[in-house]
Amino acid sequence: RRDVAHGILNEAYRKVLDQLSAGKHLQSLVARGVGGSLGGGAGDDAEPLSKRHSDGIFTDSYSRYRKQMAVKKYLAAVLGKRYKQRVKNKGRR
């Protein structure tokens, strides 16, 4: 049981570290003037993570990750035609 508990904790800890490293990567992109500038929503700003309150770091990192995933799917669909974003018209092109 203890091993299982440790496994769960380690997994959770790894996810947190992954999220933090993703945040740092995104922060470096922002510093270069690329990442964070592309996004949806009026309340979505492009401030580097370091300027924000640490409480919001996970939410912010996750929202940027979601944004990246959305853009990747879009690019794959419109420039690569590999991902079919079809809800009602599946297979229709």
Epitope: L75, V78, R82
Partner: antibody, heavy 112, light 109 residues
Framework: EVQLVESGGGLVQPGGSLRLSCAAS????????MTWVRQAPGKGLEWIGF???????YYATWAKGRFTISRDNSKNTVYLQMNSLRAEDTAVYFC??????WGQGTLVTVSS | DIVLTQSPSTLSASVGDRVTITCKSS???????LAWFQQKPGKAPKQLIY???TLASGVPSRFSGSGSGTEFTLTISSLQPDDFATYYC??????????FGGGTKVEIK
Amino acid sequence: EVQLVESGGGLVQPGGSLRLSCAASGIDLSSYYMTWVRQAPGKGLEWIGFIDAGGSAYYATWAKGRFTISRDNSKNTVYLQMNSLRAEDTAVYFCARDLDLWGQGTLVTVSS
Amino acid sequence: DIVLTQSPSTLSASVGDRVTITCKSSESVYGDYLAWFQQKPGKAPKQLIYDASTLASGVPSRFSGSGSGTEFTLTISSLQPDDFATYYCAGGYVSAGVAFGGGTKVEIK
């Protein structure tokens, strides 16, 4: 016939607003990515942004804050709201489905 | 800023010529998601190639695309009268969405 038709373009004063529409016929737009692209007179193509099937919009750096993309699936129409317009926004604005079906474009002229 | 540079900007050629247009990106194109478009005056762009090398539906086989990473090429094996137009490359970037090249005008020599 499957086609996209943009409308809403015209002459607007600097600082003004305009809402462009992109209506589809012969196809249900609701499950497609819709993209807006513009082209200044005699210039190249410039990507503005896109909206996904869920209604989330994403923008080019320069467009964010002034331009808003939305969709009304019941009307089979996508919109581009443009605020605080400048002379350099003068262009033909195109909407495109998946970048493989394009409208004919609508001209927006920003001038006093 | 990401820059897609097309060369040449203008190309004078004759019917039957083999034509090559190059598109160079300042950053690696995500997934090699690069497309080529043809545009004629007063008309909307038409997609010719997607995924760097896949021919779009209905596009003649004389058009072909190649390349990866930061360098891509559009080739027209034997130029036809209908091919005189302006060609644009468009690359995909996770950080910036889509960027278009400056265009290459193919005109009659």
